[in-house]
């Protein structure tokens, strides 16, 4: 949960307010209380955002882009509060706002700089392209341009491809990393410096498991304590890769503590889940169960991917029958 907006105090009657795209914010302004209050909010010294005088709003010449998006704290005006409540900010709203307040005793002008950030939750994906394996860190909508860093076994990697698409109001970013043939662990961090928000994706490849047909396999999936906070909503998904695409076996939602299982031979231990251990069992293995199994633990702040490779071999009985 993030605050409505946060203020950075800077000198000369100027404040910086940082808001999130499509959320509501408050542009702060205060004055020494007095009678005959006049309040004019303007954008970039040109566009009328909100006017209040003679005890009521006067929005006849308000710029259309602010229609139905602004209001004052009317019960607080007599206490010296001229702050503007601003609904559904967009990136086009970024800029300098001036609050003019006149009373019977003085006139004051406050400047507020509005910066708007976007950070739709990024994702880390594991993809197979022909014989190559890729990890892709991507964020569908982000502003300003984020800082993306990769680590391999906790060591920063200088190679960092970034595929960037700019739209009118934000960037869409993909950062792919070729991990073909690697058993290392990888970490991708995407940081939005404006919103002071960081997301981390972590990928771990477990040792391959060899099982016989009809046996069961237990695949571990435990979050790394550095990232995992049980108080935060998260989702756990187990899926299996077949023919280059993943099919979901089961998932768990922490918010509702709901478990949905799509594969009858899949089982989760409820007691272990309560201890934040999302290891799973797959019973009665058959040859077609060979492949890669992916555990994905995701929240707003991280994605933890754990890959298991399972090889199912024919049992001696089956082999002798052939």
């Amino acid at each position: 949960i993030f605050p409505l907006a946060f203020f950075i105090y800077v000198p000369m009657n100027e404040q910086i307010v940082i808001g999130r795209l499509d959320e509501d914010i408050i542009l702060p302004s205060s004055f020494e209380r007095g009678s005959e209050v006049v309040i004019h909010w303007k954008y970039q010294d040109s566009y009328k955002v909100h006017s209040y005088y003679k005890g009521s709003d006067h929005l006849e010449s308000q710029d259309p882009r602010y229609a139905n998006r602004t209001s004052l704290f009317y019960n607080e005006i007599q206490n010296g509060n001229a702050s503007l409540f601003f609904r559904r900010v967009s990136l086009l709203d970024e800029g300098i706002y001036t609050c003019y307040v006149g009373t019977a005793i003085q006139v004051i002008t406050n400047k507020v700089v509005l910066k708007v950030g976007v950070f739709l939750t990024p994702v880390m994906k594991y993809e197979k392209r022909n014989t190559n394996s890729f990890l892709i860190c991507s964020v569908l909508s982000v502003y300003p341009r984020p800082i993306i860093t990769w680590k391999m076994d906790n060591t920063p990697i200088s190679e960092n491809n970034m595929e960037e698409t700019g739209s009118l109001d934000s960037f869409s970013i993909n950062s792919p990393l070729n991990i073909t043939g690697s058993n290392s662990s990888y970490e991708c961090t995407i940081e939005n410096s404006l919103l002071k928000q960081t997301w981390t994706g972590r990928w771990t490849m477990k040792d391959g498991l060899h099982k016989m047909q009809s046996e069961h396999v237990s695949l571990s999936c435990q979050p790394v304590n550095d990232y995992f906070s049980p108080n935060q909503d998260f989702k756990v998904t187990w899926s299996r890769m077949k023919s280059g695409t993943f099919s979901v076996l089961a998932y768990y939602l922490s918010s509702s503590q709901n478990t949905i299982i799509n594969e009858s031979r899949f089982s989760w231990n409820k007691e272990l889940i309560n201890q934040s251990d999302f290891s799973m069992n797959l019973m009665d293995l058959n040859l077609s169960d060979s492949g890669e199994y992916l555990c994905n633990i995701s929240s707003d702040e991280y994605t933890l991917l754990t890959i298991h490779t399972v090889h199912v071999e024919p049992s001696q009985e089956t082999a002798s029958h052939n």
Epitope: V38, K48, Y53, K54, G55, H58, Y100, G102
Partner: antibody
Framework: QVQLVESGGGVVQPGRSLRLSCAAS????????IHWVRQAPGKGLEWVAV????????YYADSVRGRFTISRDNSKNTLSLQMNSLRVEDTAVYYC??????????????WGQGTLVTVSS | DIQMTQSPSTLSASVGDRVTITCRAS??????LAWYQQKPGKAPKLLIY???SLESGVPSRFSGSGSGTEFTLTISSLQPDDLATYYC?????????FGQGTKLEIK
């Protein structure tokens, strides 16, 4: 202290033009709306026009709309009233007067001494 | 436009008298009314704003009251210096309009 000094008055023929000025001092000019108010000889007061602190809004009395134009130069602390198509009934002392604040309130806290405009053939 | 009507047009009173001037608006103007004093040959001076608020520096013998359409300016104890014409003005809406004035004479 607040001072407003009007100038530019004089005798002019009907149909001609005249430009009045108002020089302000003793306050932050760009913070306040300024009005023109006139008074015909021996008569009452009549509001003429207002310009807001940032010149974003200008309003005129019906009797002068389309003929008079109010403007300001905040860098020079001056207010102007361009009067075109003057009529005999525009004869008056013209006062510039400072609004309580932005110009939105509409009453007059400080007044200049006035400048006389006489429209006569 | 909103019409403002003052009464009386002329008023003669003695020093020390309590004097009342009335102003009526042609439609409701809430409390958006100001009173001015104009001495001969001088610019007007603001006395009262918002119907009853005394402007800074104005003697406390001046007071205003009323709301809606009926307003009064009262001088509690008339002084020789109060010889002037008094105007009411509505600032509820453009165009701002004045009353025709009340000339106050000292007996």
């Amino acid at each position: 202290q607040v001072q407003l000094v009007e100038s530019g008055g004089g005798v002019v023929q009907p149909g001609r033009s005249l430009r009045l000025s108002c020089a302000a001092s003793g306050f932050t000019f760009s913070d306040y709306g300024i009005h023109w108010v006139r008074q015909a000889p021996g008569k009452g007061l009549e509001w003429v026009a207002v310009i807001w602190y940032d010149a974003s809004d200008k309003y005129y009395a019906d009797s002068v709309r389309g003929r008079f134009t109010i403007s300001r130069d905040n860098s020079k602390n001056t207010l102007s009233l361009q009067m075109n198509s003057l009529r005999v009934e525009d004869t008056a002392v013209y006062y510039c007067a400072r609004d309580r604040s932005s110009g939105a309130m509409g009453y007059f806290v400080y007044w200049g001494q006035g400048t006389l405009v006489t429209v006569s053939s | 436009d909103i019409q403002m009507t003052q009464s009386p047009s002329t008023l003669s009173a003695s020093v020390g008298d309590r004097v009342t001037i009335t102003c009526r608006a042609s439609q409701s103007i809430s409390s958006w009314l100001a009173w001015y004093q104009q001495k001969p040959g001088k610019a007007p001076k603001l006395l009262i704003y918002k119907a009853s608020s005394l402007e800074s520096g104005v003697p406390s013998r001046f007071s205003g009251s009323g709301s809606g359409t009926e307003f009064t300016l009262t001088i509690s104890s008339l002084q020789p210096d109060d010889l002037a014409t008094y105007y009411c003005q509505q600032y509820n809406s453009y165009s701002y309009t004045f009353g025709q004035g009340t000339k106050l004479e000292i007996k």
